[in-house]
């Protein structure tokens, strides 16, 4: 028996369902009574789901997994993982035994998009050219950790005086706070881009200073 899985990682959004694909080629005359199927976490070897004695033995993992029972006899040993969490990320091994046995590992990459950044300034009034200002770009509930980029109005990257912190909440999702300290010119636009490296999702925020008063562009 030869087990096949997708070589590319399965990317799943938090709180959605994911299918970890696994298949084998049954011999003629194959019956489910012969099948021993095990899904387990590759690293810890913790059991996730199993099928033996001709029947589905159920989920051993948070009661959030399921097989596709009607498709097993055709060689489809895929696993459905419901309501994906950050902690589900990792490698899963699909082990199939009939007479011979084989296994293969499939990677699950969990992702969550970042919110549109909110921009704040400190100080936020009585600003004059030459003042030092702190601009904070905040984006929430994303996964995995973000990449943060700052640019000025001409698109020139701003890399100095940038401090970025990322804190995971109780669900493992990250809140990003990036602080740019800059000396104001006569006017200017400062934009922050928060990128999710897995989803290739970019979330933009910007603030424009045009003399007095300061203006924030309307949200797109």
């Amino acid at each position: 028996v030869e087990v096949q899985v997708s070589e590319d990682p399965v990317v799943a959004l938090v709180d959605t369902d994911a299918t970890l694909r696994c298949s084998f080629s049954p011999e003629p005359g194959f019956s489910l009574a012969q099948l021993n199927l095990i899904w387990q976490l590759t690293d810890t070897k913790q059991l996730v789901h199993s099928f033996t004695e001709g029947r589905d033995q159920g989920s051993a993992y948070s009661n959030r997994t399921a097989l596709f029972p009607d498709l097993l006899v055709q060689g489809n040993a895929s696993l459905r993982l419901q309501r994906v969490r950050v902690t589900d990320e990792g490698s899963y091994t699909c082990f199939v035994s009939i007479q011979d046995f084989d296994s293969a590992a499939v990677s699950l990459q969990v992702a969550a998009p970042y919110s549109k950044p909110s921009m704040t300034l400190e100080p936020n009034k009585d600003l004059r050219p030459g003042n030092m200002v702190t601009i904070t770009c905040s984006s929430y509930q994303g996964y995995p950790e973000a990449e943060v980029f700052w640019k000025d109005g001409q698109g020139v990257p701003l890399t100095g005086n940038v401090t970025t912190s990322q804190m995971a909440n109780e669900r493992g999702l990250f809140d990003v706070h990036s602080v740019l300290r800059v000396v104001l010119g006569a006017n200017g636009t400062y934009s922050c881009l928060v990128r999710n490296p897995v989803l290739q999702q970019d979330a933009h925020g910007s603030v424009t200073i045009t003399g007095q008063p300061l203006t924030f562009p309307p949200e797109a």
Epitope: K45, T52, S97, D102
Partner: antibody, heavy 118, light 107 residues
Framework: EVKLVESGGGLVKPGGSLKLSCAAS????????MSWVRQTPEKRLEWVAT????????YYPDSVEGRFTISRDNAKNFLYLQMSSLRSEDTALYYC???????????WGQGTSVTVSS | DIQMTQSPASLSASVGETVTITCRTS??????LTWYQQKQGKSPQLLVY???TLADGVPSRFSGSGSGTQFSLKINSLQPEDFGSYYC?????????FGGGTKLEIK
């Protein structure tokens, strides 16, 4: 008649290496998973390594992972166990065994003795 | 990892007696349990697989039972050739684990 014959055992110093062989006959070798199991001087049986019929997947307990390598030559009907960084606790009688499905080993060889001592 | 405990470690019995050897696991292993017999100076031989299925050629006085975490091997009307060592073995998490063995001796 299913027949498994191990060879290659002997006396080796700690840190040394040894390669065991198992000649299989009487069945379609490539259709079966194979394992090495050892029996300690205290008569305990310990699983050492397993390989799938096609040779694509191998499995080891933590105690030998990274030190032992199981392999097979389906054209010649041979199973191998390359052992390195040997320790005194690896001293045992090493059996090769054929799998029936995944969980059961239905035929065993007569064993080959490995002694790790300075 | 699932732990396995085989008992007793040794047992004395007479020909014609009935004996029972047990194997307990720390977690549910369904029916993934095998029993082997090993006679002095010989290699292990398959006796029972899938907890209760007798291997080909094994006399009907042997029987396996149990599921989940508790398993037993029963030998009715012991014969002289039944004396030796018995091992249970489970398969779980793509690992194969043997019990400590039971040495069955003639009383």
């Amino acid at each position: 008649e299913v027949k498994l014959v191990e060879s290659g055992g002997g006396l080796v110093k700690p840190g040394g290496s040894l390669k065991l062989s198992c000649a299989a006959s009487g069945f379609t070798f490539s259709s079966y998973g194979m394992s090495w199991v050892r029996q300690t001087p205290e008569k305990r049986l310990e699983w050492v390594a397993t390989i799938s019929g096609g040779g694509t997947n191998t499995y080891y307990p933590d105690s030998v992972e990274g030190r032992f390598t199981i392999s097979r030559d389906n054209a010649k009907n041979f199973l191998y166990l390359q052992m390195s960084s040997l320790r005194s606790e690896d001293t045992a009688l090493y059996y090769c065994a054929r799998h029936y499905g995944s969980q059961t080993m239905d035929y065993w060889g007569q064993g080959t003795s490995v002694t790790v001592s300075s | 990892d699932i732990q396995m405990t085989q008992s007793p470690a040794s047992l004395s019995a007479s020909v014609g007696e009935t004996v029972t050897i047990t194997c307990r696991t720390s977690g549910n292993i369904h029916n993934y349990l095998t029993w082997y017999q090993q006679k002095q100076g010989k290699s292990p031989q398959l006796l029972v697989y899938n907890a209760k299925t007798l291997a080909d050629g094994v006399p009907s006085r042997f029987s396996g039972s149990g599921s989940g975490t508790q398993f037993s091997l029963k030998i009715n009307s012991l014969q002289p050739e039944d004396f030796g060592s018995y091992y249970c073995q489970h398969f779980w998490s793509i690992m194969w684990t043997f019990g400590g063995g039971t040495k069955l001796e003639i009383k």
